[in-house]
């Protein structure tokens, strides 16, 4: 069953079927004998009771006040009264845009991330049994879709999907043809979950070492799942049998990003390992960032300012 009309302020477009459904409907069924009344007030008029004789466009059913269709002069306040229960709505009927298939003020905006699942389904459960056919338009151009009862788009979003999508339901009532339009303004944005990867610590690191000893250079970064972290050294990586890239360690952060750590192990440090750049790079779709390590003999430490050392 269609849910009740709980919003107190409602804006609708002239010329479309429209209904108000009060929110004590289940209760009303229990007390069939209770007097139930619908009223309208607008401007100078105070609480005029509504009935099918008020207008050929108005229909009353158990819980529902229907307009076939709603027109500009239906703007006003509406009340449903039953015993000590009252519900009130303020209805604003706006002009239809004659130059477009939709009215800008009656558009629902949605933001979809690129490559994420994107769906538009044309449904109208209240008028479902009366709907003959439904068409889906993009920027007022009809889309050719298989299902003309409930046209649907289901896909991974791409930037070209951005636009105004209008579901137009065509229905007959008392021999007349009506249509109901629901429009979505779809904006496609980039994947907002991606971060710019960050290499942790200083960009340049002098590491004090002793010849013949081993050293472990730790490169850590905060990055996205698809980003890569790697070491670059010498003319051709892997030419020095004393240098080993250890297996990368990754830990997921609470935010769904990754803390990655990759160690370069240099064994039996020789003269050839001193004063050369060992570069750790993180690469992403956004570009690259690099931090550098230089091995310095402990005896030469006095020549370098203290703040550049990594111990």
């Amino acid at each position: 069953a269609e849910s009740c009309t709980s919003r107190p302020h409602i804006t609708v477009v002239e010329g479309e079927p429209f209904y108000l459904k009060h929110c004590s409907c289940s209760l009303a069924h229990e007390i069939e004998t209770t007097t139930k009344s619908w009223y309208k007030s607008s401007g100078s008029q105070e609480h005029v009771e509504l009935n099918p004789r008020s207008s050929s466009r108005i229909a009353l059913h158990d819980c529902v006040l229907e307009f076939w269709p709603v027109e500009l002069n239906d703007t006003g306040s509406y009340f449903f009264q039953m015993k000590n229960y009252t519900q009130k709505w303020k209805l604003n009927v706006i002009r239809r845009n004659k130059h477009s298939c939709f009215t800008e003020r009656q558009v629902t905006s949605k933001i979809v991330e690129v490559k994420k699942f994107f769906q538009i389904t044309c449904e109208n459960s209240y008028y479902q049994t009366l709907v003959n056919s439904t068409s889906l338009y993009k920027n007022c151009k009809k889309l050719l879709l298989e299902n003309n009862k409930n046209p649907t788009i289901k896909k991974n979003a791409e930037f070209e999907d951005q636009g105004y999508y209008s579901c137009v339901h065509f229905l007959h009532h008392n021999g007349k043809l009506f249509n109901i339009t629901k429009t979505f303004n779809i904006t496609i944005v980039e994947d907002r979950s991606n971060i710019v990867p960050v290499l942790l610590g200083p960009k340049l690191n002098h590491v004090a070492v002793e010849l013949g000893k081993n050293v472990r250079l730790n490169c850590s970064a905060l990055l996205n799942e698809e980003d890569v972290i790697y070491w670059m050294f010498g003319e051709e990586n892997g030419s020095d049998p004393n240098i080993h890239e250890e297996k990368e360690m990754r830990i997921m952060t609470p935010e769904g990003k990754w803390h990655a750590s990759k160690v370069l192990r240099i064994e039996n440090i020789g003269e050839s390992n001193l004063n050369v750049l060992y570069n750790c790079t993180v690469a992403s779709t956004g570009g690259t960032d690099t931090k550098s390590f230089i091995l310095v003999r402990k005896a030469d430490m006095a020549d370098i300012p203290g703040h550049v050392f990594t111990r």
């Epitope: 690469a283 779709t285 570009g287 960032d289």
Partner: antibody
């Protein structure tokens, strides 16, 4: 609309320089690197290098690194590629492309190097 | 540098038939930390910029017809067009984005037999 708009055709003499621009729109410029790819007549695609729009870091193909400079202007969302000391074999269509795999390309800029 | 070698250099296939293009990398482009292959496939037609078909070796780009598929891991990769259409005539390139320089294969020219 997401697009990369490149500057127009250039004709240069050998030894001269050329600077090609690539203006990005419709996305956050600093979220993606810009790569430059060229295609000489009758040849395949050649990756020239790229620039990180978020920090300006560059990475160039070894054979071009002493002649090429890539820059960005984040105030105008524009990337630039300058190639110096032009030779006749630099005659090519130069493309800018977004990211590290290239879902978005510019239309290309023809650079002709001829005496 | 990582060298990508495509085979064959050119290929002629009848309309509606299957076309297969191979790409071999001089070193693995599989990143063990996330099990992704850093390889893409492009279609290039004269007078147009290249068009991305496949990335991560097997993920089809949005809007690309499902007759295009990518497979393979590590060093050996394949682009398959399940039923060749006239509009598929082009040069196809593989590209690795595992390490800079982000190299391309030499290209495979696909024609209709």
């Amino acid at each position: 609309q997401v697009q990369l708009v490149q500057s127009g055709t250039e004709v240069r003499k050998p030894g001269a320089s050329v600077k090609v621009s690539c203006k990005a729109s419709g996305y956050t410029f600093t979220s993606y690197g810009i790569s430059w790819v060229r295609q000489a007549p009758g040849q395949g695609l050649e990756w020239m290098g790229w620039i990180s729009a978020y920090n300006g870091n560059t990475d160039y193909a070894l054979k071009l690194q002493d002649r090429v400079t890539m820059t960005t202007d984040t105030s105008t969302n524009t990337a630039y590629m300058e190639l110096r000391s032009l030779r006749s074999d630099d005659t090519a269509v130069y493309y800018c492309a977004r990211g590290w795999y290239f879902a978005l390309w510019g239309r290309g800029t023809l650079v002709t190097v001829s005496s | 540098d990582i060298v990508l070698t495509q085979s064959p250099d050119s290929l002629a296939v009848s309309l509606g038939e299957r076309a297969t293009i191979n790409c071999r990398s001089s070193q693995s482009v599989l990143y063990s930390s996330n099990n992704r292959n850093y390889l893409a496939w492009y279609q290039h037609k004269p007078g147009q910029p290249p068009k991305l078909l496949i990335y991560w070796a097997s993920t089809r780009e949005s809007g690309v017809p499902d007759r295009f598929s990518g497979s393979g891991s590590g060093t050996d990769f394949t682009l398959t067009i399940s039923s060749l259409q006239a509009e598929d005539v082009a040069v196809y390139y593989c590209q690795q984005f595992y390490r800079t320089p982000y190299t391309f294969g030499q290209g495979t020219k696909l024609e209709i037999k």
